[in-house]
């Protein structure tokens, strides 16, 4: 019997390499049964995840799954980082794995820095 709990299908350690200046949609796949849960996006800042209040979001409904989308209009260099979606369902908070955006300038898009480099030299992301 299929579970009727809300599930968020962001894969562990998922990542996207994207270019500054382009539009981009970050999807949070949401599985639910009856009532669509309230879903939000947040951006990780150290150990806390800061809720993205003023950002454009939308729902895309498909047959077996829905997507809660965070719109980047357009991507900016400071959008680099890790994001998480979370759903409120029957007083429970369900959190997704984090997904990381690697934002690069088109000039350095072919030379994506390693995670270690990024941690120590974040300016590599927008040269």
């Amino acid at each position: 019997k299929e579970s009727c709990d809300v599930q968020l299908y962001i894969k562990r350690q998922s990542e996207h390499s994207i270019l500054a200046g382009d539009p981009f949609e970050l999807e949070c796949p949401v599985k639910y049964c009856a009532n669509r849960p309230h879903v939000t996006w947040c951006k990780l800042n150290g150990t806390t995840c800061v809720k993205l209040e003023d950002r454009q979001t939308s729902w895309k409904e498909e047959k077996n799954i829905s997507f809660f989308i965070l719109h980047f209009e357009p991507v900016l260099p400071n959008d680099n980082g890790s994001y998480r979606c979370s759903a409120n369902f029957q007083s429970n908070l369900i959190e997704s794995h984090s997904t990381t955006l690697y934002v690069t300038d088109v000039k350095s898009a072919s030379e994506r820095p390693s995670k270690d480099e990024m941690a120590s030299r974040p300016w590599l992301l927008y040269r």
């Epitope: 500054a20 200046g21 539009p23 357009p74 000039k107 898009a109």
Partner: antibody, heavy 119, light 107 residues
């Protein structure tokens, strides 16, 4: 060397549809980070961003004109076409085709084409 | 939409003068601002990107500064070819918007 050139009618009648073509060389619209767009400038007035086609196939429009604008690309011909419906005398302007690479700063511009809307 | 305002709307100056033009955004745009120069009958030319980056081929007498909502374009020593209209443009969010322009003319 990057060049862009606008072509289309210089005079259109009110209610007609304007079709402008931007023919470019020196770059490809399938190259990462590239965008080709349209900006207009009424005589003696400021610049107004209209629409942009991105290398990804995404398109974005000015919200105030979105219902009247369509931007399309023909990558093989190195062309981007802007259509604007229901033209009005207030749409009289010089229309520029622009190039961007990466962030949305317009580093190359066509010479511009003056479109007059009059009956 | 983000509204861009510029001041002054026009400035009269002499060759050799230092000229400063300001641009203000109706909301914070970080450093995602460009400056353009336009001469009569010509297309605009990109001078400054990302608030302070000098576009290739642009003379070093042009400089830009600022972040958030307030930005400045400075011409350190005005040359005869600098008499033109200058526009700022925000690249922070769609739709991209321009300031109304500042005309620099001969005193």
């Amino acid at each position: 060397q990057i060049t862009l050139k606008e072509s289309g009618p210089t005079l259109v009648k009110p209610t007609q549809t304007l079709t402008l073509t931007c023919t470019f060389s020196g770059f490809s619209l399938s190259t990462s980070g590239v965008g080709v767009g349209w900006i207009r400038q009424p005589p003696g007035k400021a610049l107004e961003w209209l629409a942009q086609e991105f290398w990804t196939g995404d398109k974005r429009y000015s919200p105030s004109l979105k219902s009247r604008l369509t931007i399309t690309k023909d990558t093989s011909k190195n062309q981007v076409v802007l259509t604007m419906t229901n033209m009005d005398p207030v749409d009289t302007a010089t229309y520029y085709c622009t190039h961007k690479l990466g962030m949305n700063y317009f580093d190359y511009w066509g010479q511009g084409t003056l479109v007059t809307v009059s009956s | 939409d983000i509204q861009m305002t510029q001041s002054p709307s026009s400035v009269s100056a002499s060759v050799g003068d230092r000229v400063t033009i300001t641009c203000r955004a109706s909301q914070g745009i970080s450093s995602w601002l460009a400056w353009y120069q336009q001469k009569p009958g010509k297309a605009p030319k990109l001078l400054i990107y990302a608030a302070s980056g000098l576009q290739s081929g642009v003379p070093s007498r042009f400089s830009g500064s600022g972040s958030g909502t307030d930005f400045t374009l400075t011409i350190s020593s005005l040359q005869p070819e600098d008499f033109a209209t200058y526009y700022c443009q925000q690249a922070n969010s769609f739709p991209f918007t321009f300031g109304p322009g500042t005309k620099v003319d001969i005193k």
